[in-house]
């Protein structure tokens, strides 16, 4: 299943994009566990200062002290690591300064498996402070497997810092990734630490490794790309089915539901029923009765048709074909109208033509 749905479900789609931190190389402060850390907000004319950690408001507690333009963390722990920001609110504008805190007692290795960034005496990084490469946000790199539908575009990113500023190169399946290795080549934006491959095809599947290095060290990170030739989707139900139907009392009727699904679907026929004269429960959800569901001995063709024999007035109402798979659920509904029988004759109105 792709790690993203190409088009979000409207009900889940955020009204605004998630906050993105637009920093290439924030100040970095490093401390060992148990040490205390003090950082001064480097903003001028800061009348009112507010603090955040990883985008969440930061308030004082038994280990965090906020005094004026200073942030103090007593007895630092690895959980204190993250992206901090101080925002100075002025009458006409506001300004934000970002910095990283790394609380670690391990020297960073060539790969990023341990998610650590090197033990140093905590000092602000500046031009005199040489530093091996480090990832600016290891959490965002934790998801390594990415499935993308064919014909779409993938962007791999490995934002890093270091002093001097590291360089970046890319490998595919452990070997140098050259433009001629794929039709249309690829694009790199070093300032965004990104690799873009347009219109991916199955041959693009594989491991992509960014190698970030300067004279003080090298780190690397590997993403696995899977190219899905068809987007997995929830079941698709044929338009217009099931169709509304009507019959007389004592007659027979059938509802048809055509289901298309790449993943194995589970199909149910459901009747909307009344309980104590109400169609809806106290929670506002409708009362439902499962009439037919796929079982061990039921074929797909059998489950796609719901037969109702010897119809009574109680059978009138709304019927729903519900199909679900590992990706989601789809359903279509139709109404059954039951008419009184004229005399003794059992007359059935012409059933709808189900073929399109």
């Amino acid at each position: 299943r792709p790690s993203f749905s190409l088009v979000e479900d409207t009900t889940l789609e955020p009204e605004e994009p998630p906050t993105k931190y637009q920093i290439s190389q924030p100040e970095v402060y490093v401390a060992a566990p148990g040490e205390s850390l003090e950082v001064r907000c480097l903003l001028k004319d800061a009348a009112v200062i507010s603090w955040t950690k990883d985008g969440v408001h930061l308030g004082p507690n038994n280990r965090t002290v906020l005094i004026g333009e200073y942030l103090q963390i007593k007895g630092a722990t690895p959980r204190d690591s993250g992206l901090y920001a101080c925002t100075a609110s002025r009458t006409v504008d506001s300004e934000t300064w970002y910095f990283m805190v790394n609380v670690t007692d391990a020297i960073s290795s060539g790969d990023d498996e341990d998610d650590t960034d090197g033990a140093e005496d905590f000092v602000s990084e500046n031009s005199n402070n040489k530093r091996a490469p480090y990832w600016t946000n290891t959490e965002k790199m934790e998801k390594r497997l990415h499935a993308v539908p064919a014909a779409n575009t993938v962007k791999f990113r490995c934002p890093a810092g270091g002093n001097p500023m590291p360089t970046m190169r890319w490998l595919k399946n452990g070997k140098e990734f050259k433009q001629e290795h794929r039709i249309g080549g690829y694009k790199v934006r070093n300032q965004h630490w990104s690799l873009i491959m347009e219109s991916v095809v199955p041959s693009d599947k594989g491991n992509y490794t960014c190698v970030v290095e300067n004279e003080y060290g090298s780190i690397n990170h590997t993403y696995h790309l899977d190219v899905v030739e068809r987007s997995p989707h929830r079941p698709i139900l044929q338009a217009g089915l099931p169709a509304n139907a009507s019959t007389v009392v004592g007659g027979d009727v059938e509802f048809v539901c055509k289901v298309y699904s790449d993943a194995q679907p589970h199909i149910q026929w459901i009747k909307h029923v009344e309980k104590n004269g109400s169609k809806y429960g106290p929670d506002g959800l409708p009362y439902l009765k499962v009439l037919k569901a796929a079982g061990v001995n039921t074929t797909d063709k059998e489950i796609e048709v719901l037969y109702i024999r010897n119809v009574t007035f109680e059978d009138a109402g709304e019927y729903t074909c519900l199909a679900g798979n590992s990706i989601g659920i789809s359903f279509h509904s139709a109404w059954l109208t039951v008419l009184p029988a004229p005399g003794r004759e059992k007359e059935i109105t012409a059933s709808p033509d189900y073929l399109e």
Epitope: S3, E15, P149, K155, R230, S231
Partner: antibody, heavy 127, light 107 residues
């Protein structure tokens, strides 16, 4: 070669309905999406909505939500824009555009890009 | 909704000129910004996606830059076929929104 051809435009009275079609060819239909964008006479572009052709999911602009429905028939490689309860302000040239996703694996969001566009079809809502 | 504001609304330039159009988003859209070119009576054409990536087949005189809220489209040396209206569009927030357009006219 990727091609998108719209049809179905015309003159309709306020409150009326119209269905636009967008016939696509030259790309794997179910892997990408189709967006509808409109342009009122002498005005700028306005995004109307989008469908993903693989799973049928849809998104709409608030201005058309509840009135317009985007669908697709994958067997015919055709997307549709069903427009109901039409208003004078819906008068515009309607374009369909192939829409693909740029999957950002770091910030975990998808950027939508419309790379191929149809020629457009004019819808006029007037009494 | 995220508002996209382009400036200028129109400009006059000569063939060979360097032209810069700016686009400002009302909130952070990261690099999820595309630029389109539209000639009168024609459909728009994609020029730039992800703020700075040139779409396949687009001449290299076009370039894009920026991230967050401020973006720029630059045409390094204006050609006769570049006289058109240019639109920016953010494509991460819902709904997708376009700028009002910048018309590039012949001086």
């Amino acid at each position: 070669e990727v091609q998108l051809v719209e049809s179905g435009g015309g003159l309709v009275q306020p409150g009326g309905s119209l269905r636009l079609s967008c016939a696509a060819s030259g790309f794997p239909f179910t892997s990408t999406g189709i967006s509808w964008v409109r342009q009122a006479p002498g005005k700028g572009l306005e995004w109307v909505g989008r469908t993903h052709l693989g799973d049928g999911s849809t998104n709409y602009a608030d201005s058309v939500k509840g009135r317009f429905t985007i669908s697709a028939d994958t067997s015919k490689n055709t997307a549709y824009l069903q427009m109901n309860s039409l208003r004078a302000e819906d008068t515009a040239v309607y374009y369909c555009a192939r829409t693909y996703g740029i999957y950002d694996t770091y910030d975990m969001y998808t950027e939508y890009v419309m790379d191929y566009w149809g020629q457009g079809t004019l819808v006029t809502v007037s009494s | 909704d995220i508002q996209m504001t382009q400036s200028p609304s129109s400009l006059s330039a000569s063939v060979g000129d360097r032209v810069t159009i700016t686009c400002r988003a009302s909130q952070d859209v990261d690099t999820s910004l595309a630029w389109y070119k539209q000639k009168p009576g024609k459909a728009p054409k994609l020029l730039i996606y992800s703020a700075s990536f040139l779409y396949s087949g687009v001449p290299s005189r076009f370039s894009g830059s920026g991230s967050g809220t401020d973006f720029t489209l630059t045409i390094s040396s204006l050609q006769p076929e570049d006289f058109a209206t240019y639109y920016c569009q953010q494509s991460t927030g819902h709904p997708q929104t376009f700028g009002q357009g910048t018309k590039v006219e012949i001086k």
